[in-house]
Structures are given as structure tokens and as C-alpha cells.
């Protein structure tokens, strides 16, 4: 197994590591046959790397001290395995008025303090969205707040003091939306024990449809860390995530459409999944649609992806063009498609790992080719890789942090394209940043749909 001999880790650390990776990163322990130590060691190493990458640790593939410390840190019980900001398939509440009910109260705190902490936690999210929350005392609420210990009626039993503090379910009927807090923790209004308000803000994020963030400053980061509740604020990543689901606090906000009907082009909260140039046109991808913008012309047209490329999926996540080769690369999950002269090439999709990504990379957020350097930049979570298109291999020294090398951009991005020989256009939620890569700074901030004359 991938043990670092210098730290002389005991067997129980390995077992603890296995259990942690099973619970939060999908390591299948029944696929770790003792008779195949090399095979099982590789599986475990991959999962350690995945965890280290997601939680911002040095990626060693070893159960080193900092990794074990992180594994022992108190945390949310929801797995990190998806690497998404929004939960898969994006379950969201299809209404703006959401009810909650506190099913039972922890004896650790006064009832009024529990009520206040939960109310303030909901308020954190209503402040940045059009959502309104109201507490009910009887009947069926959308979100049920429960204090429970051990097994408590779902698939995910609590584990006693420490370890998992709480968990919550994404929007939906029945158990959907419910937030469970481990009664074996000592819940408090302050820095001692476990702060209920801070934990509730995180869990309510899940109740509204958010997954875990790999940004350590985000409230949706998986592990618990006390911060001063009087000065607490959501990170930019949290706000981007929740507003990508519900929009900002403006009245009469359009809800995400359950039937995936055509998004409103001039919706001020419109975000894009991927953007790329194709010759003198710009393609903007969203769900199963794309808009076609011919450079310098105001007119745009919306099309179904399937109408142009019937064999391609909806929900394209990243795209880039190598104009000199008349090639466009389209990415979804761990696969990519090659389009040549606007026609899909046979024998695709292929795995993104053929570019040389490590196995823990499961999807690409955005990609852009720079013809000056003949390099493609791949953005994954809060990091990016640089790929040499001539040598067909990754440049050494990557990944690097987006925020370190693209001043004012990040920690994550939705889409990016290259234009006018010197600009990258980065998309983050409903915002767009014109970035001069020679000056290495943002030169303009725009709305994502500014290209359409909105």
C-alpha cells in the first residue's frame, strides 16, 4: 500500500484511510484483494491523490501526516466524490418560498438559540438569492432539521463524537432537502464545541442543491473550521454556486427550467457551460442549446446541439478551437469529441486521460487554445494544466492555481475563449472578464451575455 515509510504509519491508519476514502471518494474496499497488493495499492493511491487534489493538499498519493490530519478533521458526511459545485443533474427547488421545520432540539443549547442559529443560517442564503424561507411548527416542511445520533432512518448513520458532524439531502420530496445534525457533537453558539450556525449554513447549502467546493475559503468546503460568526460571509465561490442555481436576489427571478427549455438570452443571470470560437463565429453552449454569434454582427441564433451534431450529448462542459487545423474539441465528463470542418470525427468520444490528465480528474470545466504559444489551457476546479499541442503532451510543472497565474480570475471558471489576438474571455456565473494575457490582468468586466446586445 502507498505508505510513506518515514512516518511509520500504523496499520490502523491505513484502515482508517480506506474507510475515509470509501465514504467520501468511492474507494471500493471489496476491490482491494489482499492477494493483489500492487493493484490494490494503485487503486488506493489514486483515491488518495483524488482526495489531496480536491482538499488542496500536496498531491503525493501517500497517507502522509497532512493527509491523515485532514482525514481526521471533523467534516460534513456528504461525499466529495463528484467534484461538482451543483449536485449532479442539478436538483433545485422549483419555487422561491421554502418552508423548514425543526423536528427536535439538541439539549446542548437553549431552544431560542437553536431557532436563531437556524434562522440566521437560512438568511445567509436568502440574502444572495431570490429564495424566501419560513419556519413552520407543524405539518410537512420542505426542509426538516433533525438532531439524531447513530442510525436514524437513512442510509447514512452518524459515527459518534467527531468525524461526521452533519449531512443533508439535495432538493426533492420526502427526505429531499432534510438536514441532519449529529447529536453526539456538542452544539454551541460560539467557538467551543461545534458551532451550529456555521454547520447549518453548510448543510443548508446542500439542502438547496450545492455540492462540496474545493475552495478552502468556501463555506461548502467539506471540513469544519470555526470562523467568527459576527464577521462571517459567504465566499465568492459559494455565491457563484448558489446563484448559478437560483439567480441573484432580484424579484421575480426566473427559476431554472425543469424541462430544459430554451434559456432566455437576455436573462441577467444567464451563465454558459462552454464557449469557443469556430472561425469567425462564437459558439455559446448551455444545456442542450448553443447560440451562434457571428463576430461584429448583432444577430444571434439559437440551435439544438443535436440539430448540428446528432451524435453529441447535451451539457457540453468545455470547448476549444485550433483554427489552423479547423478543429474544435468538445468535452463532457471524462470524454471528448473532435469536430473537423464542423463534422464530428469517427472513433470519438475518447477519454480525456489521453491528454495526460491524472485519474482523479473526472471532468474539464473550461479550455482555451492560444495560437501564439500553440498551447491549450485546461481549467479543472481551482487549477489549470497547460498542454503542448505540437508535442501532444502536458507541459511540466502543472497543474497550477488559477488565482496565482490569472490575476483576478478564479478560483473556478465556467468557460473561456480566446479572441482578438490578445484576450481571453473568462466566464464565471453571470459575469465575464476580458483578460489581456500580455498585460496579465483583467481589462473589462461584463455580463456573460454582453455579446448579444442585451
Amino acid at each position: 500500500l502507498p505508505l510513506n515509510s518515514s512516518t511509520s504509519l500504523e496499520k490502523n491508519n491505513v484502515l482508517f484511510g480506506e474507510r475515509y476514502l470509501e465514504k467520501f471518494y468511492g474507494l471500493e474496499i471489496n476491490k482491494l484483494p489482499v492477494t493483489k497488493m500492487k493493484y490494490s495499492g494503485n487503486l488506493m493511491k489514486e483515491k488518495i491523490q483524488e482526495m489531496q487534489h480536491f482538499l488542496g493538499l500536496k498531491v503525493t498519493g501517500q497517507l502522509d501526516t497532512s493527509t491523515l490530519e485532514m482525514m481526521h478533521a471533523p467534516r460534513c458526511g456528504v461525499p466529495d466524490v463528484h467534484h461538482f459545485r451543483e449536485m449532479p443533474g442539478g436538483p433545485v427547488w422549483r419555487k422561491h418560498y421554502i418552508t423548514y421545520r425543526i423536528n427536535n432540539y439538541t439539549p446542548d443549547m437553549n431552544r431560542e438559540d437553536v431557532d436563531y442559529a437556524i434562522r440566521k443560517a437560512f438568511q445567509v442564503w436568502s440574502n444572495v438569492t431570490p429564495l424566501k424561507f419560513s419556519k413552520i411548527n407543524t405539518g410537512m416542511a420542505d426542509i426538516l432539521v433533525v438532531f439524531a445520533r447513530g442510525a436514524h432512518g437513512d442510509f447514512h448513520a452518524f459515527d459518534g463524537k467527531g468525524g461526521i458532524l452533519a449531512h443533508a439531502f439535495g432538493p426533492g420530496s420526502g427526505i429531499g432537502g432534510d438536514a441532519h445534525f449529529d447529536e453526539d457533537e456538542f452544539w454551541t453558539t460560539h467557538s467551543g464545541g461545534t458551532n451550529l450556525f456555521l454547520t447549518a449554513v453548510h448543510e443548508i447549502g446542500h439542502s438547496l442543491g450545492l455540492g462540496h467546493s474545493s475552495d478552502p475559503k468556501a463555506v461548502m468546503f467539506p471540513t469544519y473550521k470555526y470562523v467568527d460568526i459576527n464577521t462571517f460571509r459567504l465566499s465568492a465561490d459559494d455565491i457563484r454556486g448558489i446563484q448559478s442555481l437560483y439567480g441573484d436576489p432580484k424579484e421575480n427571478q426566473r427559476l431554472p427550467n425543469p424541462d430544459n427549455s430554451e434559456p432566455a438570452l437576455c436573462d441577467p443571470n444567464l451563465s454558459f457551460d462552454a464557449v469557443t470560437t469556430v472561425g469567425n463565429k462564437i459558439f455559446f453552449f448551455k444545456d442542450r442549446f448553443f447560440w451562434l454569434k457571428v463576430s461584429e454582427r448583432p444577430k444571434t441564433s439559437v440551435n439544438l446541439i443535436s440539430s448540428l451534431w446528432p451524435t453529441l450529448p447535451s451539457g457540453i462542459e468545455a470547448a476549444y478551437e485550433i483554427e489552423a487545423r479547423n478543429q474544435v474539441f468538445l468535452f463532457k465528463d471524462d470524454k471528448y469529441w473532435l469536430i473537423s470542418n464542423l463534422r464530428p470525427e469517427p472513433n470519438y468520444p475518447k477519454s480525456i486521460h489521453s491528454f495526460g490528465f491524472p485519474n482523479f480528474v473526472k471532468k474539464i470545466d473550461a479550455a482555451v487554445f492560444n495560437p501564439r504559444f500553440y498551447r491549450t489551457y485546461f481549467f479543472v476546479d481551482n487549477q489549470y494544466w497547460r498542454y503542448d499541442e505540437r508535442r501532444q503532451m502536458m507541459d511540466p510543472g502543472y497543474p497550477k492555481l488559477i488565482t496565482k497565474n490569472f490575476q483576478g480570475i478564479g478560483p473556478k471558471i465556467d468557460a473561456v475563449f480566446y479572441s482578438k489576438n490578445k484576450y481571453y474571455y473568462f466566464f464565471q456565473g453571470s459575469n465575464q472578464f476580458e483578460y489581456d494575457f500580455l498585460l496579465q490582468r483583467i481589462t473589462k468586466t461584463l455580463k456573460s451575455n454582453s455579446w448579444f446586445g442585451c
Epitope: P79, P88, G153, D154, F155, F169, G170, S173
Partner: antibody, heavy 122, light 103 residues
């Protein structure tokens, strides 16, 4: 309309292997948790295994842990159950069922297939 | 571990009768209880979720109640098509079933 159709059942000797499939249609398969539930002849229902929408996380009943492997191919809208080291007590009708969206399973089985019979006997 | 105990295990009743089936958990499961109906040779069908919410398309003669450890499924006026086996369930645990037969 949501449809789930199991296949792959049959007669197998103790210690043998079998792979069940469940073809899904009528919903966005890649958004949902999927589960396997079984029912021995004349007996009650027993939960067997579940898998997260992305396929990266799985759960098993103690009775099958280490012997059965659940997996899915979202591009084919298909759920699988690989059953190894089969025992007589694994004889049952195996149903696949659709759970909820999201990172966590609810155990709320909204839709069920018709089932496929697995008989383990020498 | 949580266990679910269903009673009775079988029950004879007539068309038009009011029937109640109970399910008890050995510790609190809040309102996380579902009820399914299964007819011979068929797959189970969801009737009630979250203890009292009627699944879409299920007739209103079916109702559920309870929270914590004690739950009931009530059929207000039995119809011929209701003779079947009923299971309570939470997460990965099913009750042993109640077979409802014609008297």
C-alpha cells in the same frame, strides 16, 4: 414514462457468477441514484446495493459485501450487478429501482423493474 | 441497527372494510418511512412516502400516519384490487410484509 427492464438472470451453480443488467428509459438516468432489491421465493423484500448518479460511490448490504459489485454505464443508460461466489441463499427475483437525485441516497424507491429470477442450485 | 416490525403478518378483510397495518421501528426514524404494495408476480409499487405523503396516482383511500417509531397505513374502504402484500420500509430496511387476503 419511466421504464426499468432487468435481464441476465438464470440458473447458476453455487460458487458461480452472473451479471445482471437493468436498461433504463423515460428519465435522465445519469441524474439518479439506482438500487438493487431482491426477493427470495415466497419471502419479503431485501435491499442489496445502491450506486450514486456518477457511479463513483456504492453501498452494499452486509449479506453481499465483497461478493457483489454494482456499476453503471450512463452512456448506455444501464445499471449492472456483478454477482460472484453465489450461494443458494442468493436465489431470488432481483429488481432494479430508481431512487432520488443528488449526492445521497434516500431509499425512496419511486420506480421498479419487473425483476429477473436468479436460481443458485447444483 | 434499526429494525422494522410489521403487524399483522396476514389479515383477512372484505370489500368495503377499513383496514389498518402498523409498522414499528426499534428507534426513531422521524418521518422516514415508506409503504409499498406488491401483487403476486409483480414488482412492488410505492404508495406512501415520508410517512404520510401520497404518491402521485395512488387512490386517496390510502393514507399513512405516524412519526418517530410508530406508523400506520390505512385503507379507508377496501376495493377488490387492494388485496396484495404491503411492506413498510426505511432506507435499506423492509418490514416483513402484511398479506391482505379476501375474507
Amino acid at each position: 414514462e419511466v421504464q426499468l427492464l432487468e435481464s441476465g438472470g438464470g440458473l447458476v451453480q453455487p460458487g458461480g457468477s452472473l451479471r445482471l443488467s437493468c436498461a433504463a428509459s423515460g428519465f435522465t438516468f445519469s441524474h439518479y441514484w439506482m438500487q438493487w432489491v431482491r426477493q427470495a421465493p415466497g419471502k419479503g423484500l431485501e435491499w442489496v446495493s445502491g450506486i450514486v448518479p456518477s457511479g463513483g460511490l456504492t453501498m452494499y448490504a452486509d449479506s453481499v459485501k465483497g461478493r457483489f459489485t454494482i456499476s453503471r454505464d450512463n452512456s448506455k443508460n444501464t445499471l449492472y450487478l456483478q454477482m460472484n461466489s453465489l450461494r443458494a441463499e442468493d436465489t431470488a427475483v432481483y429488481y432494479c429501482a430508481r431512487d432520488i437525485m443528488g449526492a445521497y441516497a434516500s431509499g425512496l424507491f419511486h420506480n421498479w423493474g419487473r425483476g429477473t429470477l436468479v436460481t443458485v442450485s447444483s | 441497527d434499526i429494525q422494522m416490525t410489521q403487524s399483522p403478518s396476514s389479515l383477512s378483510a372484505s370489500v368495503g372494510d377499513r383496514v389498518t397495518i402498523t409498522c414499528r421501528a426499534n428507534q426513531s426514524i422521524y418521518t422516514y418511512l415508506n409503504w409499498y404494495q406488491q401483487k403476486p408476480g409483480k414488482a412492488p409499487e410505492l404508495l406512501i412516502y415520508a410517512a404520510s405523503s401520497l404518491q402521485s396516482g395512488v387512490p386517496s383511500r390510502f393514507s399513512g400516519s405516524g412519526s418517530g417509531t410508530d406508523f400506520t397505513l390505512t385503507i379507508s374502504s377496501l376495493q377488490p384490487e387492494d388485496f396484495a402484500t404491503y411492506y413498510c420500509q426505511q432506507a435499506g430496511i423492509f418490514g416483513q410484509g402484511t398479506k391482505l387476503e379476501i375474507k
